[in-house]
């Protein structure tokens, strides 16, 4: 998990003849808020699906009038980041599509008006936990600027935030077969365990220990199949010993959406449908005509010549909702189960898996462990769906064949000399340290600071870590 | 073998409505999307909407939205298409279509139930 | 809506004839095009899918081919159980749509 962050440094007119209009004027004032919209992939297949990655709206701009004459000049930005949070791992690759609005605030009928300025998209690759990228696009006379990146939030890190780190639970080491998270160097990584008998066909988890259910089935292990005849309410959370699902709280309780909308949950939050002459993100936009452009995706307005007078928007196919704001494909369907990113490619639908599922629709949980070998005595762990071999002292690599130099990543702390050995790797301290790592100081009176030297052993000799 | 087990044939009156069912056997019925298309006496085919059985999504035409209500029964594998405010344009044979081109390189066949002949008469 | 225009509606044919039924779509579909024969008081039965490939069990006699906005469906040698009436179908798009269909009658 983590979450992709966009700042936009700058709104204006691009270089070259032709300067844009100043989108504002005394009578229209107005303000400028963005969109964004994250795909995963590079490939043109990925720039038609939906945000899959996941949108996100800027706050309202300053409000802006137009000096009289003036050419546009930049144009008053919002203040923060916009923030889209990104639940399984980030792609690494990604398209984007950065829309610029203008909210105008002039006598309008029930409310303010919205109409796009600008829309600029692109493709790129970045690795989350890096520096901030800047950017610089144009679409047609405006121009602008932003930065952005992306970065993991804890426990995740790595370049994709696939990796899990957590506190060390012994001061010492981390786990068998588990490394220290680099930059995190006092954190292990931890491997993604479930809960344990968490059904493997209906539960999976995103963080250890838990056991979170698939659609239609429920109890703390996910091997409840939900019964709704008896339930009021199609929503958790659920009750393992019924199976039926008790009404919780959801994105739509209470109805955000304004003027008559009715909303239906999405994975990520709600969503309104909204009566004809109403649009926005909760049917707030009102009193519209067909002058203000109220279809999108190409939708044909007809009507609504005074606000009076109601519009309809005659949606082209593949578009639904009132202002034709849905785009409608199989996706829409949500074939893809287990996390997996649907495609629709017209002639046929595409699954792309998380890793540890296979089958047209994601539907096959893989058992990465059977017939892998671990060599040199390693054995296989599962994790998230991903085959690890946890290897033997003294051997590395995906399946253990490479013998490992244990001295290599310089373990012995403050000067101790790293010995390789057939059993791991031997520390010989430097004076004043003790520890399988040498990694305690010793206190001037002798005593060692945690944990004492075992019988037999004097602080600063060699001792075997097995 | 796949088999779509279609009910019965109705008469209605205007204004009522009819709720036909389509029972599935054969396959895992939660794989497929099911759609429903219709055919008036004489007439060519229209395609009403689609609903997947896994997770109750569905999608309608929109000539039919707010009238059309399609629902599943996963413990008896059944699909069934509710049609509201009938009139007598409504007058057709129902059918129950299994989706056929699904996913990409994997490719099952379409399959349709026996259809179900709804008349609409005062 | 992707309209889907077939020609022509009303086809006699011999058996051993070739005959060609084309569908025309109105805006580019890809090859998402399906071809069904229905017989009278029968549900329509799938014989090509993705434009050109032939579904399971279904005579070699029968080809489709066509991609973006014209299609067309091709039996090379008539039998007696091809005389039906044949369909298009786009499912590229929501809503799917069918075209108005072409009775092939005997001769």
């Known amino acids: 998990a983590g979450v992709f962050e966009l700042q936009i440094h700058s709104f204006g007119p691009g270089p070259g003849p032709g300067a844009p209009r100043s989108p504002c004027s005394a009578r229209l004032p107005c303000r400028l808020f963005f969109r964004v919209c994250l795909k995963p992939g590079l490939s043109e297949e990925a720039a038609e699906s939906p945000c899959a990655l996941g949108a996100a709206l800027s706050a309202r701009g300053p409000v802006y009038t137009e000096q009289p004459g003036a050419p546009a000049p930049d144009l008053p930005l919002p203040d923060g980041l916009l923030q889209v949070p990104f639940r399984d791992a980030w792609p690494g690759t990604f398209s984007f599509i950065i829309e610029t609005w203008r909210e105008e605030l002039g006598d309008q009928i029930g409310g303010p008006a919205w109409s796009l300025l600008a829309r600029v998209a692109g493709r790129r690759r970045l690795a989350a936990g890096g520096p901030w990228a800047r950017d610089i696009q144009r679409a047609g006379a405006w121009e602008l600027r932003f930065s952005y990146r992306a970065r993991c939030e804890p426990p995740a890190v790595g370049t994709a935030c696939t990796r899990l780190c957590r506190p060390r639970s012994a001061p010492s080491r981390c786990g068998p077969g588990l490394r220290p998270c680099a930059p995190l160097e006092d954190e292990c990584e931890a491997p993604l365990v479930c809960r344990a008998g968490c059904s493997p066909e209906h539960g999976f988890c995103e963080q250890p220990g838990e056991c979170r259910c698939l659609e239609g089935w429920t109890g703390p292990l996910c091997t409840v199949p939900v019964s709704t005849s008896s339930c009021l309410s199609p929503r958790g959370p659920s009750s393992a010993t019924t199976g039926c699902l008790v009404p919780g709280p959801g994105p739509c309780d209470g109805n955000p959406c304004a003027n008559g909308g009715s909303c239906s949950e999405t994975p990520r939050s709600f969503e309104c449908t909204c009566p004809r002459g109403f649009y926005g993100l909760r049917c707030e936009v009102s009193g519209v005509t067909c002058a203000d452009g109220p279809c999108f995706n190409g939708g044909l307005c007809v009507g609504g010549a005074d606000p009076d007078s109601a519009y309809i928007c005659h949606c082209p196919p593949g578009f639904q909702g009132s202002n034709c704001e849905k785009r409608v494909d199989r996706c829409s369907l949500q074939p893809c189960r287990n996390g997996g990113l649907c495609l629709d490619l017209g002639h046929a639908l595409r699954c792309r898996c998380r890793a540890g599922f296979a089958g047209p629709r994601c539907e096959h949980d893989l058992d990465d462990c059977a017939g892998r070998a671990c060599a040199n005595g390693g054995t296989c762990v599962e994790g998230g769906g991903a085959h690890r071999c946890s290897c033997a002292l003294g051997f590395g690599g995906r399946d253990c064949r490479e013998r490992a130099d244990p001295c290599a990543a310089r373990p012995c702390a403050h000067g101790g000399r790293c010995y390789a050995h057939f059993s791991g790797l031997v520390c010989a301290c430097a004076p004043g340290y003790m520890g399988a790592r040498c990694e305690f100081p010793v206190h001037p009176d002798g005593a060692s600071a945690l944990p004492a030297a075992p019988p037999g052993l004097r602080p600063g000799d060699p001792q075997r870590y097995l | 073998q796949v088999q779509l087990v279609q009910s019965g044939a109705e008469v209605k009156k205007p204004g009522a409505s009819v709720k036909v069912s389509c029972k599935a056997s054969?396959?895992?019925?939660?794989?497929?999307?099911m759609n429903w298309v219709r055919q008036a006496p004489g007439q060519g085919l229209e395609w009403m909407g689609v609903i997947n059985p896994y997770n109750d999504i569905t999608i309608y035409n929109q000539k039919f939205q707010g009238r059309v209500t399609m629902t599943v029964d996963r413990s008896t594998s059944t699909v069934y298409m509710e049609l509201s405010s009938l009139r007598s344009e409504d007058t057709a044979v129902y059918y129950c279509?299994?989706?056929?081109?699904?996913?990409?390189?994997?490719?099952?066949?379409?399959?349709w139930g026996q259809g179900t002949l709804v008349t609409v008469s005062s | 809506d992707i309209q889907l225009t077939q020609s022509p509606s009303f086809l006699s044919a011999s058996v051993g004839d070739r005959v060609t039924i084309t569908c025309k779509a109105s805006q580019n579909v890809g090859i998402a095009v399906a071809w069904y024969q229905q017989k009278p008081g029968k549900a329509p039965k799938l014989l090509i899918y993705?434009?050109?490939n032939r579904y399971t069990g279904v005579p070699s006699r029968f080809s489709g081919s066509g991609s973006g906005t014209e299609f067309t469906l091709t039996i090379s040698s008539l039998q007696p159980e091809d005389f039906a009436t044949y369909y298009c179908?786009?499912?590229?798009?929501?809503?799917?749509?069918f075209g108005q269909g072409t009775k092939l009658e005997i001769k």
């Open positions: 993705a434009a050109s």
């Open positions: 054969g396959y895992t019925f939660t794989d497929y999307f």
């Open positions: 179908q786009q499912y590229s798009t929501y809503p799917y749509t």
């Open positions: 279509a299994r989706e056929g081109v699904l996913y990409d390189g994997y490719y099952e066949g379409a399959y």
